[in-house]
């Protein structure tokens, strides 16, 4: 039997307002509204919390019966829909211990896990997975790309008691591995031996000057020489112009700086590699994954352009149940959502074309009127006469 610690689908109208608490840490936090957005698969089922004010911080949270994930799998799952074509804004959730003062939740409030998509400018389109380990927020060392389209997507984080994890988007695995390998929770297993240093006589030169090579006698020639073909101009006046000096030219016999031939260095020892030792500061931690207490799920976000919808929150210990829940919610409505969006886009295109046609028609009508106005006044004549006179109908 799966343990479901938290589940929120917003299926009871305004009922969510009694379960979710707004932070009062700042007076100008943005407001969440219940909405299924401009397009959806099912108007009722797709209702979720939507950010409604541009350029705001948001801070809203819901509490649940506190639990620990020690010795069991933790699954965090929710859907996010950036229907506003987001430029910069968060779509992630934070899991807090139940000691959090929900009315004072803010960006620096200590959390256990932060997970979900984040988009900001061209440089950030990633899924954050951050664990608070011994008081420090530790970021994943991998780059997990998030979805940046306008549709609803399902994000799932699985953390297992064997210290492995998995990130899924739309019920497909996008990343997995071990917590110790993919985060810097622990000091490195090996470090450079602090007592080792490169021996004085360690020769890292692969090639050396050939000691038997010597510079040829005739090597040193000046780079520039007086032009032997230059002649003093006839009208050169030494008193007026000073002593005549021929212009200089590049010396064809100049050989440049002499460098001895290179030979293999008989004493070459290769590049010195700093020996490593076991790091005395390293000790494995089999309980990296574990937290004593989860009690609050929070949305602590910044959004430049609002419109993001959060829905179908689930915290459980059962991977299969989470996958099933995802398929029964996001899975069921995603196709219809796309259909509705495509239909809207098509209608918009049609409207745009109609508007363009109308505009063109108006322009043609206006041009006709203008031409009539600018033509000379014509006498009332029959068409045949008019044609003979050279009049042409506009």
């Amino acid at each position: 039997e799966p343990a479901v610690y938290f589940k929120e689908q917003f299926l009871d109208g305004d009922g969510w307002t009694s379960r979710w608490i707004e932070s009062k840490h700042k007076s100008d936090f943005g407001k969440f509204v219940l909405s299924s957005g401009k397009f959806y698969g099912d108007e009722e089922k797709d209702k979720g919390l939507q950010t409604s004010q541009d350029a705001r911080f948001y801070a809203l949270s819901a509490s649940f019966e506190p639990f620990s994930n020690k010795g069991q799998t933790l699954v965090v799952q929710f859907t996010v829909k950036h229907e506003q074509n987001i430029d910069c804004g968060g779509g992630y959730v934070k899991l807090f211990p139940n000691s959090l003062d929900q009315t004072d939740m803010h960006g620096d409030s200590e959390y256990n896990i932060m997970f979900g998509p984040d988009i900001c400018g061209p440089g950030t389109k990633k899924v954050h997975v951050i664990f608070n380990y011994k008081g420090k927020n530790v970021l994943i060392n991998k780059d997990i790309r998030c979805k940046d389209d306008e549709f609803t997507h399902l994000y799932t984080l699985i953390v297992r008691p064997d210290n492995t994890y998995e990130v899924k988007i739309d019920n497909s695995q996008v990343e997995s591995g071990s917590l110790e390998d993919d985060w810097d929770f622990l000091p490195p297993k090996k470090i450079k031996d602090p007592d080792a240093s490169k021996p004085e006589d360690w020769d890292e030169r692969a090639k050396i000057d050939d000691p038997t090579d010597s510079k040829p006698e005739d090597w040193d020639k000046p780079e520039h020489i007086p032009d032997p073909d230059a002649k003093k101009p006839e009208d050169w006046d030494e008193e007026m112009d000073g002593e005549w000096e021929p212009p200089v030219i590049q010396n064809p016999e100049y050989k440049g700086e002499w460098k001895p031939r290179q030979i293999d260095n008989p004493d070459y020892k290769g590049t010195w590699i700093h020996p490593e030792i076991d790091n005395p500061e390293y000790s494995p931690d089999p309980s990296i994954y574990a937290y004593d207490n989860f009690g609050v799920l929070g949305l602590d976000l910044w959004q430049v352009k609002s419109g993001t919808i959060f829905d179908n929150f689930l915290i459980t210990n059962d991977e299969a149940y989470a996958e099933e829940f995802g398929n029964e919610t996001w899975g069921v409505t995603k196709a219809a959502e796309k259909q509705m969006k495509d239909k809207q886009d098509e209608e918009q295109r049609t409207r745009r074309m109609m508007r363009t046609k109308m505009r063109m028609r108006r322009m043609r009508r206006t041009r006709r009127k203008m031409r009539r106005k600018m033509s000379p006044a014509r006498p009332r004549t029959s068409c045949r006469e008019a044609c003979l006179q050279g009049w042409t109908e506009a």
Partner: antibody, heavy 127, light 107 residues
Framework: EVQLVQSGAEVKKPGSSVKVSCKAS????????ISWVRQAPGQGLEWMGG????????NYAQKFQGRVTITADESTSTAYMELSSLRSEDTAVYYC????????????????????WGQGTTVTVSS | SYELTQPPSVSVAPGKTARITCGGN??????VHWYQQKPGQSPVLVIY???KRPSGIPERFSGSNSGSTATLTISRVEAGDEADYYC?????????FGGGTKLTVLG
């Protein structure tokens, strides 16, 4: 990579204000957070505040609250730091520094340090 | 407010290893960044997030953070490493710098 070029040296009277500019080039201005750090002669570095141009909101060190205003103009990729009610202790080199914006929260760029610095602007406050 | 403590000066012979410490209350819970500043120049980021090196910074520079001290280690010290070094953290929406350490390369 972004480059930061600051305005020239200033000599100011006590009680007046100074506005230093920091123009970014070679990168997307909205992808960075800009911090202002000052260094009095022979002293260490002191953070004054910062701004994330894409957010438009600034964050100030307690010590300078009410006396410093940090702004950004995205159209010219320029950040500004204005310090008012100048006193002789404000004589320092003022640096702007950028941090890559790796997310949509105030805290993100502070995970990464300030990886590009301007050349510094010397402000002398003297009567 | 949060404070970071650095030794005012550290001296080291060329080729040897220099260690500069940065102490602060529960500093291991912070991400520590290190900057190098040579006379008359702007600071340069040499280590971020405790131990990561920005591109272009030699491998000789490394960092660690455990217990109540973060450490910047410079192995095989060169004359060009002589500079002031500052540690920095982010605490309660504020950037905090250490007082700086002057590294002198002997000889």
């Amino acid at each position: 990579e972004v480059q930061l070029v600051q305005s020239g040296a200033e000599v100011k009277k006590p009680g007046s204000s100074v506005k230093v500019s920091c123009k970014a080039s070679g990168g997307t201005f909205s992808s960075y957070a800009i911090s202002w750090v000052r260094q009095a002669p022979g002293q260490g570095l002191e953070w004054m505040g910062g701004i994330i141009p894409i957010f438009g909101t600034a964050n100030y060190a307690q010590k300078f609250q009410g006396r410093v205003t940090i702004t950004a103009d995205e159209s010219t990729s320029t950040a500004y730091m204005e310090l008012s009610s100048l006193r002789s202790e404000d004589t320092a080199v003022y640096y702007c520094a950028s941090s890559p914006l790796r997310g949509s929260g105030w805290y993100w760029h502070y995970y990464y340090g300030m990886d590009v610095w301007g050349q510094g602007t010397t402000v002398t406050v003297s009567s | 407010s949060y404070e970071l403590t650095q030794p005012p000066s550290v001296s080291v012979a060329p080729g040897k290893t220099a260690r500069i410490t940065c102490g602060g209350n529960n500093i291991r819970a912070k991400h520590v960044h290190w900057y190098q500043q040579k006379p008359g120049q702007s600071p340069v980021l040499v280590i971020y997030q405790d131990s990561k090196r920005p591109s272009g910074i030699p491998e000789r520079f490394s960092g660690s953070n455990s217990g109540s001290t973060a450490t910047l280690t410079i192995s095989r010290v060169e004359a060009g490493d002589e500079a002031d070094y500052y540690c920095q953290v982010w605490d309660s929406s504020t950037v905090v710098f250490g007082g700086g350490t002057k590294l002198t390369v002997l000889g």
